[in-house]
Interface confidence: low
């Protein structure tokens, strides 16, 4: 029998350029009579144009929703009701071709054409894009608060904030023809739930979304977004009601930046430069294409690309890369944003060099990508260390910490976290190396103690990049480095003259002069430690709540012992900057470290002194007794302590702790405590120092109170941020 044909709605969005009309400011105000009159005419013209083609039989509805410069650009959408089987045949490209063909056929015609009665439409200026009913609904919901802005070359335009009565607004932005728009978003409040979405076209087309940001992001307080061309739309959706705008938006046109380079690398190892997407750290734009050609001086070397919070992964060929596509020597890889460092190592087999291509495959983009490039020795990629094939990084081998996700850096170790004697491969503890006392059969532990040695897991790297064999040589009163750098920056780690810790004892004034109390409105929240004249280190999770993220809330007390009283040695500071580790992950507690810059430098005294920071190679031996201090609860669930408590804890082997916590302990964590519990940190101790005393009598910061199951529970150790695992970031910030 007869079967009715199934019809479907196909939605298109687009723009066209009118050559015989000029844009005026009146046309930006939807309530103006000029806008109403122009839309009526433009709508009529659009309908007539569509119905003049074979698309006419499918015409359903259309709307011109705004105007822009150029001389006059009309922005519109229309809906065609088409048979389902023809859906794929009427792609935006086909529809655009049909309409352009119609326009061209009447350019020189003297016959009366309805759609040319008032408008001279430029066939080359017609753009048709795919849209959806949902896109039109989103557009319509913003039209009550619609802003059009044209921004000229050399201008930076600050956009007027959203209408507080509206729940959604749209900024339609346009710039000069051959430029691209760069939008800058700066969050100004610590807490909000507003959502901003940026589009690479004039309206909110989901398929042309560049990015969307939500809720006063602390990790991205400033976001810069590039469009692929001179048009962009920004849609705001209201979050919590706030009289103050939680953000500032500004836009400027910028010239296209070429992203092609030919480089010849020098005959040396390590990083030699940086490649980045245009306008880094701006988000890369849709349609970005970069091509970098690097020539390597010899086949002894491979090319290393070191990424920050970005990794490359293999992807099935038919799936698009959502975070950037890379082709390296004809291998297709997809970018992936991660909270870890990553390196891609490219073996070199021919002197022709290596071409690296980066492409944004879809309109959705992300933070600009920057990569450090350099050479590595193909026969020995990680001298003295282990090459982790999972992430391309060189990691310490056989130090008792599984730095590589697959744990292979701790496999097949003859001596784990100990020194291997040359004579018979016996293992001796590290503090016995270069201590003046031969412990190996023929004294190999005391050889080469006065000279440079190849760098390795436990060697100390001097400022001149040479390495010394003696473990933990920092600040022990004896220069071991040729340049004496192991004895520099040693005004630290000494206790003053002095006669929430569970199972602890009360500290005396000056006993822990680096201890900080971080307070909000007079209430102790977290501990911390002074590490430099203007820097206090603490745990990132202290600022986890959005309400705790603003620097103005915090006061830092140093030289304090009692919470309920002040004494002359005590000093307080406001916080000028708060920096969380960029890889900090709330759920896993990984990289749980933050740095606070004080509003003025400390004046050192018996009660206020910094603790010593360890080198990356500093070895804190499991079994060592160290100390934690803080005003945390004296029992699980209890109130904080009035007096600064101290307790000794034992450093626990990583594999034992990892097992206790079911393998949730990362290489940036260190465990301390006792199998039977009792002595431990507790609520309120977070961010406080775990310090270990070196043979020199100086105290080194080993960890920061981070997490654990309960307080002082049997079988569950305290977990601390491992300072040696985050020391490079600390030094980068502080220096």
């Amino acid at each position: 029998g007869y079967k009715a044909e199934v019809m479907v709605s196909q939605v298109y969005s687009g723009s066209l350029r009118v050559l015989n009309r000029h844009f005026s400011q009146d046309l930006t105000r939807r309530e103006s009579s000029a806008f109403r009159s122009e839309t009526a005419k433009a709508q009529k013209m659009l309908k007539e144009l569509i119905t003049s083609t074979r698309l006419g039989t499918y015409y359903n509805s259309s709307s011109v929703y705004s105007f822009g410069e150029g001389p006059l650009t009309c922005f519109f959408w229309f809906i065609l009701q088409i048979p389902e089987h023809r859906r794929l045949m009427l792609s935006p490209e086909v529809v655009q071709a049909l309409l352009v063909e119609e326009l061209l056929s009447t350019v020189n015609s003297s016959a009366a054409v309805p759609y040319r009665a008032e408008y001279e439409v430029d066939p080359e200026g017609l753009v048709i894009l795919e849209a959806s009913v949902k896109d039109i609904a989103a557009l319509n919901s913003t039209l009550g608060c619609y802003r059009y802005s044209y921004v000229g070359q050399g201008q930076v335009l600050r956009l007027k904030g959203p209408d507080h009565l509206a729940s959604s607004c749209l900024w339609h932005l346009q710039g000069p023809k051959d430029l691209m728009l760069k939008l800058r978003l700066e969050w100004t409040l610590a807490e909000c739930r507003d959502r901003l979405a940026m589009y690479d076209v004039a309206g909110p087309l989901e398929k042309r979304l560049i990015t969307s940001v939500y809720g006063c992001s602390r990790q991205e307080p400033v976001v810069e977004v590039l469009a692929s061309g001179a048009i962009m739309a920004v849609v705001w959706k209201k979050g919590l009601h706030s009289y103050y705008d939680p953000f500032v938006l500004s836009v400027q046109p910028v010239v296209f930046q070429a992203c092609e380079v030919n480089l010849t690398l020098d005959n040396r190892l390590d990083s030699q430069g940086v490649l980045s997407t245009p306008y880094f750290p701006s988000y890369y734009s849709p349609q970005t294409h970069c091509s970098w050609h690097l020539t390597v001086p010899s086949l002894d070397y491979g090319l290393a690309l070191w990424f920050d919070a970005y990794a490359l992964r293999r992807q099935k060929y038919d799936l698009p890369c959502t975070q950037g596509q890379w082709t390296i020597q004809n291998r297709r890889l997809c970018g992936l944003r991660i909270l870890q460092p990553y390196a891609e190592r490219i073996p070199v087999v021919a002197t022709a060099g290596i071409t690296i291509n980066f492409t944004s495959q879809i309109s959705l983009t992300g933070p600009g990508v920057r990569v450090h490039y350099g050479l590595y020795n193909q026969s020995d990629p990680c001298p003295g260390e282990f090459l982790c094939s999972v992430n391309g990084l060189c990691v310490p081998a056989c130090d008792g910490v599984k730095d590589c996700p697959n744990g292979l850096d701790e496999r097949n170790c003859v001596c784990r976290a100990t020194f291997q004697c040359k004579e018979d491969s016996t293992c001796i503890s590290l503090p016995k190396v270069c201590d003046g006392q031969p412990d190996c059969l023929n004294g190999s532990d005391e050889e080469q103690c006065q000279e440079g040695v190849p760098c390795g897991t436990f060697t100390f790297q001097c400022e001149d990049r040479s390495c010394v064999k003696k473990p933990n040589p920092q600040c022990d009163g004896r220069p071991d480095c040729r340049d004496g750098s192991d004895e520099e920056h040693c005004d630290c780690g000494l206790q003053g003259p002095s006669s929430r810790i569970v199972g602890g004892a009360v500290s005396s004034e000056g006993e822990w002069p680096w201890q900080a109390s971080l307070q909000v409105r007079g209430r102790h929240i977290c501990g911390g430690a002074l590490i430099a004249d203007r820097w206090v280190i603490t745990a990132a999770h202290c600022f986890q709540e959005d309400s705790m993220a603003s620097t103005v809330l915090w006061t830092v007390f140093l030289g304090k012992v009692w919470q309920n009283s002040r004494w002359p040695g005590e000093v307080s500071f406001k916080v000028s900057r708060l920096l969380l580790h960029p890889y900090h992950e709330e759920d896993s507690h990984d990289y749980d470290v933050a740095l606070l810059q004080l509003d003025h430098p400390v004046v050192r005294s018996a009660a206020v002194r910094p603790v010593c920071l360890p080198a990356r190679s500093h070895f804190f031996e499991p079994g060592l007794h160290c100390w934690i201090t803080g005003w945390g609860a004296l029992r699980e669930g209890g109130p904080i302590s009035n007096a600064l408590q101290k307790v000794d804890v034992q450093l626990i082997p990583q594999d034992l702790c990892s097992e206790v916590y079911r393998y949730q302990v990362t290489p940036r964590m260190l465990c301390a405590g006792y199998r039977k519990g009792k002595k431990d940190a507790c609520q309120g101790d977070s961010g406080g120092p775990l310090v270990c005393k070196a043979l020199s009598g100086r105290w080194f910061l080993a960890g920061l109170v981070s997490w654990g199951l309960g307080c002082g529970r049997p079988n569950y150790f305290g977990v601390y941020t491992r300072i040696t695992g985050v020391i490079s970031w600390i030094q980068q910030v502080v220096t």
């Epitope: 034992q650 594999d655 034992l656 097992e659 393998y663 199998r675 039977k676 079988n715």
Partner: antibody, heavy 121, light 106 residues
Framework: QLQLQESGPGLVKPSETLSLTCTVS??????????WGWIRQSPGKGLEWIGS???????YYNPSLKSRVTISVDTSKNQLSLKVNSVTAADTAVYYC?????????????WGQGTLVTVSS | SYELTQPPSVSVSPGQTATLTCSGD??????VCWFQQKPGQSPLLVMY???KRPSGIPERFSGSNSGNTATLTISGTQALDEADYYC?????????FGGGTKLTVL
């Protein structure tokens, strides 16, 4: 309730490889709370720990046996295996498998009934 | 390597208290468990985490551990308690058993 049953050849020739299987019933070997261990007891002697394994593949071995021992699990069969290479008469013993508390408080409970392996030509 | 030392034998009259000891360097920092083994049988756990009794183990069994010595005490010893007793602890990455004590009920 949980039961463990060791099986394998009762006689192995010197220098050959001893292979035993422990089949677990009444509980999953892939439980995240437990390790699974092998212990042996030479005739008239005390208990000697051979090694322990977590279902994800993490293993710990007795240092004195480490070079000759391999422990593995097959979670699909709910089985634990032991291989000891290059055996000598000193490897003659009753071999037990046991479930071990996973958090290094270290107790073994329950135990299999044990299987006697004699190394002799 | 870490060692646990137990006396080879202990004798006790029925109804008396038997005290079995296990010593090792800083053993009190570690947890200790105890196994009972009767001839021809598999070991049976009688005490774990120093002082905890598995279900089914009589109340006359008790344990303690401090300093360098762990103790298993059997009060009101019965003839059926006659067996070999092994202590066990962890050291770093290894499980360590004591050499065992033969308890004889006279």
């Amino acid at each position: 309730q949980l039961q463990l049953q060791e099986s394998g050849p009762g006689l192995v020739k010197p220098s050959e490889t001893l292979s035993l299987t422990c089949t677990v019933s009444g509980g999953a070997i892939s439980s995240s709370n437990y390790f699974w261990g092998w212990i042996r007891q030479s005739p008239g002697k005390g208990l000697e720990w051979i090694g322990s394994m977590y279902y994800t593949g993490i293993t710990y071995y007795n240092p004195s046996l480490k070079s000759r021992v391999t422990i593995s699990v097959d979670t699909s069969k709910n089985q634990l295996s032991l291989k000891v290479n290059s055996v000598t008469a000193a490897d003659t013993a009753v071999y037990y498998c046991a479930r071990q508390d996973g958090f290094r408080t270290g107790w073994f409970d329950p135990w299999g009934q044990g299987t006697l392996v004699t190394v002799s030509s | 390597s870490y060692e646990l030392t137990q006396p080879p034998s202990v004798s006790v009259s029925p109804g008396q208290t038997a005290t079995l000891t296990c010593s090792g360097d800083k053993l009190g920092d570690n947890y200790v468990c105890w196994f009972q083994q009767k001839p021809g049988q598999s070991p049976l756990l009688v005490m774990y985490q120093d002082t905890k009794r598995p279900s089914g183990i009589p109340e006359r069994f008790s344990g303690s551990n401090s300093g360098n010595t762990a103790t298993l005490t059997i009060s009101g010893t019965q003839a059926l308690d006659e067996a070999d007793y092994y202590c066990q602890a962890w050291d770093s990455r290894t499980v360590v058993f004591g050499g065992g004590t033969k308890l004889t009920v006279l």
